[in-house]
């Protein structure tokens, strides 16, 4: 059995960012499991004093696109589209710096979802990054052109 499937997003937690677009899942039954994890994480985030407004504004859509990545329509096999590295780095190092420090000391804060690791993402100028999912972090354009 091949690994990886493209299926319509059927959840609620990330519907405002993803709608019913096709997302990549490692296994057929994973969408429901991750939906539960994300719902629980968002509930915790909503009651947390560790999350600033400037962070949550972009961290929440970013987490949604990380947990439920769009399928790469240009690929002949099921393949996820990655977050954009420049946005990931700004989120981690600028907008959510304090939150990331807290989260890194609690590796399973997102339950069975790993914290996004910007180092895993292709470099901005590489061909692999051409189709990355852009959240729309305003500072990312500035960061992208000056590094």
């Amino acid at each position: 059995e091949e690994d990886g499937f493209c299926q319509p997003y059927r959840g609620i937690a990330c519907a405002r960012f993803i709608g019913n677009r096709t997302v990549y899942m490692e296994s057929l039954h994973m969408q429901g499991e991750i939906e539960n994890q994300i719902t629980a994480a968002f509930t915790m985030i909503g009651t947390s004093s560790h999350l600033s407004d400037k962070c949550s504004q972009f961290a929440i859509p970013s987490l949604c696109h990380y947990a439920f990545p769009y399928c790469d329509e240009t690929s002949s096999v099921p393949k996820p589209r990655d977050l954009c590295r420049d946005e990931c780095e700004i989120l981690e190092n600028v907008l959510c710096q304090t939150e990331y420090i807290f989260a890194r000391s609690n590796p399973m804060i997102l339950m069975r979802l790993k914290l996004p690791n910007c180092e895993d993402l292709p470099q901005p100028e590489s061909p692999e990054a051409a189709n990355c999912i852009r959240i729309g972090i305003p500072m990312a354009d500035h960061h992208h052109h000056h590094h």
């Epitope: 393949k79 790993k114 690791n117 292709p122």
Partner: antibody, heavy 120, light 107 residues
Framework: EVQLVESGGGLVQPGGSLRLSCAAS????????IHWVRQAPGKGLEWVGY????????YYADSVKGRFTISADTSKNTAYLQMNSLRAEDTAVYYC?????????????WGQGTLVTVSS | DIQMTQSPSSLSASVGDRVTITCRAS??????VAWYQQKPGKAPKLLIY???FLYSGVPSRFSGSRSGTDFTLTISSLQPEDFATYYC?????????FGQGTKVEIK
Amino acid sequence: EVQLVESGGGLVQPGGSLRLSCAASGFNITGYYIHWVRQAPGKGLEWVGYISPNSGSTYYADSVKGRFTISADTSKNTAYLQMNSLRAEDTAVYYCARDSRRYVRPFDYWGQGTLVTVSS
Amino acid sequence: DIQMTQSPSSLSASVGDRVTITCRASQDVNTAVAWYQQKPGKAPKLLIYSASFLYSGVPSRFSGSRSGTDFTLTISSLQPEDFATYYCQQHYTTPPTFGQGTKVEIK
């Protein structure tokens, strides 16, 4: 079917080099970490290091740092373990295994292993 | 690095016996512990993940549990094909670390 197949093992002299390959099929390695784990004869499992093929970022065990290099060719869906300055204590069966990049998961698929013998 | 202390290192048992293997983590690893079975000349096979979840295709006689930093693998009724070496592993942080292994032999 998901499969990992190692190759490249053999007999090498101390101080020598060897390159192992881990060919993946049934899944795209860019969505995973590919780990190398070794097992000395009659001993337990020891983690060697891993690569995130998507970006090329790597992590190594202290025992091999500076001597071993992990790389990947995503077009061939294959990861590699380049072993230099080999020592007798590097003698082991070397396995590659995969681990999800997104999810907290153990190593769900392993290769069959390839034996590396370091001896004069 | 997180140490995983596994015990016993070996045990003798008969077919039908209930077998328990334990692993203690040197620090909190939440539920990020897996158990593997390895037979001579073969690669390890995943049995249990996230401390207590049975991996696909693994017989239900295998089960896992957690109590704080103590993790247990139980084989409810040992079968002839279960004689092998068992390893625990934490994958909570890098580097992932393994227990020393428990060899289950025929009495």
